[in-house]
Amino acid sequence: MGKGDPKKPRGKMSSYAFFVQTCREEHKKKHPDASVNFSEFSKKCSERWKTMSAKEKGKFEDMAKADKARYEREMKTYIPPKGETKKKFKDPNAPKRPPSAFFLFCSEYRPKIKGEHPGLSIGDVAKKLGEMWNNTAADDKQPYEKKAAKLKEKYEKDIAAYRAKGKPDAAKKGVVKAEKSKKKKEEEEDEEDEEDEEEEEDEEDEDEEEDDDDE
């Protein structure tokens, strides 16, 4: 994503992110010299989060609310540097990033939420869907997780084939430049893809806002 503007306000953190941060700090206190196995650590964090009561999650939600307010406050006064609004080139033929299990679940239940609560804002619909997902037992999430895993597998094959063929304008740029740190390029693409998924979800919501239908 290039080097960002250092003056740009730090992005807002979710309640889960605050929780993970707290977990990290606790872990550091208990094991100051131990190195962290991140996948193990993330798994443990996620398991702990799933079993936490709404009351326990409350303090992290408050932290997230406060941080959101901070971010919004800072963004009001932030002036982006010239030319930063230009979108990076995205190849329309590039394989689309696969949806997450939660995204698939949202596609199933968004019509119900919107039909039963026609006045809800996009944000509130998303919040309700998040609550529904969090209150859904692991085994009821399984079909979505299986489908997401299948789609991810397909995407990985497709993206590998796409990269092997080379991007459409790679030829124009000269081989040396094209070879610039493959790893960095992949990281950037993953970041872009994550943005895409969020944008798609927003677009989907906006499309649905136009055509609106008991708990």
């Epitope: 529904m132 209150n135 037992a137 489908k147």
Partner: antibody, heavy 119, light 108 residues
Framework: EVQLLESGGGLVQPGGSLRLSCAAS????????MTWVRQAPGKGLEWVSS????????IYADSAKGRFTISRDNSKNTLYLQMNSLRAEDTAVYYC????????????WGQGTLVTVSS | DIQMTQSPGTLSLSPGERATLSCRAS???????VAWYQHKPGQAPRLLIH???TRATGIPVRFSGSGSGTDFTLTIATLEPEDFAVYYC?????????FGQGTKLEIK
């Protein structure tokens, strides 16, 4: 008023097939996860299979895997259970039910339809 | 699979009395994923409680659910004549979603 009406039950020989239907009314069918639950004579309730609101996701009990197929037609407000390779132990009253939320517990049930597998 | 065991198998009480029905899971459950149903012959089962203790819509306040871990209870504070039926507990936290064998509540 929410109503679920099962049909398609009857007497069938072992190895035979049967298709159960459940007609739904009184609610927006396409919003809800639906399920089939059965009760063998003199026994308790047994979950069979569930399907997501769009029909894109299904889940089965081991006893139903590979033999039964759950499906739905949201345009007709109807849930189906296609039962193949039927066995004597599939003899039961089959209920269709609506999931209250995204979880597998059910707030409205039909009266049931009896399936008898016997030679 | 998680086994749900209900006790007693049959409970004989009179209208006006308090009924306590028990349900034990073969492994620890989050109370969030326990439901109770009432079933009368020839009728559709009726959801009473979900989430361990949340009464379903239209269920009278005399019905209450409690418990955690492996032990769950359905209490009917003051029995009404229409409460005599078979009661099932169910866990829906882990597939296959399993029911207890039922407790028959009969008039003494």
């Amino acid at each position: 008023e929410v109503q679920l009406l099962e049909s398609g039950g009857g007497l069938v020989q072992p190895g035979g097939s049967l298709r159960l239907s459940c007609a739904a009314s009184g609610f927006t069918f396409s919003y809800y996860m639906m399920t089939w639950v059965r009760q063998a004579p003199g026994k308790g309730l047994e979950w069979v299979s569930s399907i997501s609101p769009s029909g894109g996701y299904t889940i089965y009990a081991d006893s139903a895997k590979g033999r039964f197929t759950i499906s739905r037609d949201n345009s007709k407000n109807t849930l189906y259970l296609q039962m193949n390779s039927l066995r004597a132990e599939d003899t039961a009253v089959y209920y269709c039910a609506r999931a209250l939320s995204t979880g597998s517990f059910w707030d409205y049930w039909g009266q049931g339809t009896l399936v008898t597998v016997s030679s | 699979d998680i086994q749900m065991t209900q006790s007693p198998g049959t409970l004989s009480l009179s209208p006006g009395e308090r009924a306590t029905l028990s349900c034990r899971a073969s492994e620890s459950l989050t109370s969030t994923y326990v439901a109770w149903y009432q079933h009368k012959p020839g009728q559709a089962p009726r959801l009473l409680i979900h989430g361990g203790s949340t009464r379903a819509t239209g269920i009278p306040v005399r019905f209450s659910g409690s418990g955690s871990g492996t032990d769950f209870t359905l209490t009917i504070a003051t029995l009404e004549p229409e409460d005599f039926a078979v009661y099932y507990c169910q866990q829906y936290g882990s597939s296959p979603y399993t029911f207890g064998q039922g407790t028959k509540l009969e008039i003494k």
